[in-house]
Amino acid sequence: AVNGTSQFTCFYNSRANISCVWSQDGALQDTSCQVHAWPDRRRWNQTCELLPVSQASWACNLILGAPDSQKLTTVDIVTLRVLCREGVRWRVMAIQDFKPFENLRLMAPISLQVVHVETHRCNISWEISQASHYFERHLEFEARTLSPGHTWEEAPLLTLKQKQEWICLETLTPDTQYEFQVRVKPLQGEFTTWSPWSQPLAFRTKPAALGKDT
């Protein structure tokens, strides 16, 4: 028996991956469990094995096809089940009808690079990964810059309310090491959430020219 709450949460990356987490507070799962996906209008079923990510949560990825293939649409519904082995049979632990485009979480942006750097400014670009063409331009971004002596949590968030895959950081300090991260979110979906943060991009501003203010 479970004393606390349990939760089964899944997100679609908009192309060919559904990532799921099954958690049970106060439960020790000593049996094998899996997630099973049964779409309403596709000929495939898919299963992944839940693997521990912490003491009380397990995760897996339903790989639906090649990374950039469009495996689901806005009208698809996928019935998702958590199944755990109980003796010789599988027992359903959780179930839901999953609307992929209501539960989106994209992959973290990739290919971050410094386009141009000056003493007080830096222009950075990035790319989105495995994002559906259905979104067209309906995406937004959040970015943050890590300054010396601060933590990521302290960094103010910069919001880009459009599909803009670059940013010009201003009012930087000359000859200073910074790090930069960005994340993306579609505008669509009641339960849609931000992507993970990108890998940090480290850069250094140029030193100020001696005897001259730039």
Partner: nanobody, 125 residues
Framework: QVQLQESGGGLVQAGGSMRLSCAAS????????IAWFRQAPGKEREFVGA????????FYASSVEGRFTLSRLNDQSTVYLQMNSLNPEDTGVYYC??????????????????WGQGTQVTVSS
């Protein structure tokens, strides 16, 4: 949020059948998994079964599997629990419940946010 109301309970003889209804009002019914739990006198509330938002998926407690069947009519905001081959151990108060919108249904009553008042089912031998 969603409000839930059970009906259809009563007295039935062992081996008989009964159909319970769970009527919902409030938020969009088709966003919610609906589950049934029951509580016998002096016992803890136990999971009976759950049905997904569209009705495509169901699962049941092993004690009722093959005897109880869940169905739903989203246009009428109602879930039905058809109970066949009833026995005295099925006696109790039957509650329908829902987790938060978009959440999965589980066997754990702690995961459910919305509850009806319950309807009494008594199976006599």
């Amino acid at each position: 949020q969603v409000q839930l109301q059970e009906s259809g309970g009563g007295l039935v003889q062992a081996g008989g059948s009964m159909r319970l209804s769970c009527a919902a009002s409030g938020r969009t019914f088709s966003n919610y998994v609906i589950a049934w739990f029951r509580q016998a006198p002096g016992k803890e509330r136990e999971f009976v079964g759950a049905i997904t938002q569209t009705g495509r998926g169901t699962f049941y407690a092993s004690s009722v599997e093959g005897r109880f069947t869940l169905s739903r009519l989203n246009d009428q905001s109602t879930v039905y629990l058809q109970m066949n081959s009833l026995n005295p151990e099925d006696t109790g108060v039957y509650y329908c419940s829902a987790p938060r919108s978009g959440r999965a249904g589980t066997r754990n009553q702690m995961d459910y946010e919305y509850w009806g008042q319950g309807t009494q089912v008594t199976v006599s031998s």
